[in-house]
């Protein structure tokens, strides 16, 4: 399912998983949006368990999740930290 | 530079408790994503992993040592440790610390220190 | 836990020879597999990561690849410096488990 490396393009995750990352296991979001060598959207997600993972970020349960973080984010102290990563 | 070094006593009998010190530089254990993790390979033959212990003091062990092993950190030294109580033979091997980087790609044990022989006898 | 077999364990090939070492994984580790070179006397330095995926400053010869769950390196020409243990890791799931190592000697 997942594979990530170094590519040409400079693109952190050459496959991505769509199944679902549950919200109490996700410990950190990265979204880093095209640029510096890199044609696509990358979503990165940290677990708890100590994993890294590369998600595809037309997922529709991570639009939802990424919702939901972001409203929280406003109200209280957000669950799982969302970086939107800059494209240098 | 990422360098990582290992300390330890080199002999001790079975029994005793093994006290094993990884200092390194180049990164620091206070990082969001950082590890360190230690294996150990008997002379002539493959690696074992022991345990990983992580920035935010997560750790994790090897189950076939988990009740005589322990992994702890030292942030404002740049140490981690490793010890493994009531030695035997069995334990006689060079004992290696390893970085290990929450990173996209992920590669676990991507800087090793030198290692450090570590003999169990009467 | 996870059991990584590695196959041969010693292996003795002339320069210029095309190489493979395998190791097949107990359960599914998803491409979550590193090769390691070590040397005599040195510590292990990661060759392949992800199963398929040169880490910087290996050279092209190596290279790796993966059937069902049968992981392998492949070294296309055999040269006299890749004389070395080689070990795969599964990072999959705790505990981490490696192969038992194959050492590559030279005819």
């Known amino acids: 399912i997942l594979e990530a490396h170094y590519t040409n393009l400079k693109c952190r995750c050459s496959g991505v998983i769509s199944t679902v990352v549950g919200l109490n296991i996700i410990d950190r979001i990265q979204v880093t949006p095209p640029g510096n060598g890199c044609p696509k959207t990358e979503v990165v997600i940290w677990t708890k368990m100590k994993k890294v993972i590369c998600v595809n970020p037309r997922a529709k349960w991570l639009q939802r999740l990424l919702r939901h973080v972001q409203s929280k984010s406003l109200s209280s102290t957000p669950q799982a930290p969302v970086s939107k990563r800059r494209a240098a | 530079q990422v360098t990582l070094k290992e300390s330890g006593p080199g002999i001790l009998q079975p029994s005793q408790t093994l006290s094993l010190t990884c200092t390194f530089s180049g990164f620091s254990l206070t990082t969001y994503g950082m590890g360190v993790g230690w294996i150990r390979q008997p002379s002539g033959k493959g690696l074992e992993w022991l345990a990983n212990?992580?920035?935010?003091?997560?750790?994790y062990s090897n189950p076939s040592l988990q009740s005589r092993l322990t992994i702890s950190k030292d942030t404002s030294n740049n140490q981690a440790f490793l010890t493994i109580t009531n030695v035997d033979t069995a334990d006689t091997a060079t004992y290696y610390c390893a970085r290990s980087e929450l990173v996209m790609p992920y590669v676990p044990f991507d800087y090793w220190g030198q290692g450090v022989r570590v003999t169990v006898s009467s | 836990d996870i059991q990584m077999t590695q196959s041969p364990s010693s292996m003795s090939a002339s320069l210029g020879d095309r190489v493979t070492i395998t190791c097949q994984a107990s359960?599914?580790?998803?491409?979550?597999l590193i090769w390691f070179q070590q040397k005599p006397g040195r510590s292990p330095r990661p060759m392949i990561y992800y199963a398929t995926n040169l880490a910087n400053g290996v050279p092209s010869r190596f290279s790796g690849s993966r059937s069902g769950s049968d992981y392998s390196l492949t070294i296309s020409s055999l040269e006299s410096e890749d004389m070395a243990d080689y070990h795969c890791?599964?990072?999959?799931?705790?505990?981490?488990?490696f192969g038992s190592g194959t050492k590559l000697e030279i005819k």
């Open positions: 890791l599964q990072f999959k799931q705790y505990p981490f488990t």
């Open positions: 212990i992580w920035w935010d003091d997560d750790k």
């Open positions: 359960q599914d580790i998803d491409n979550h």
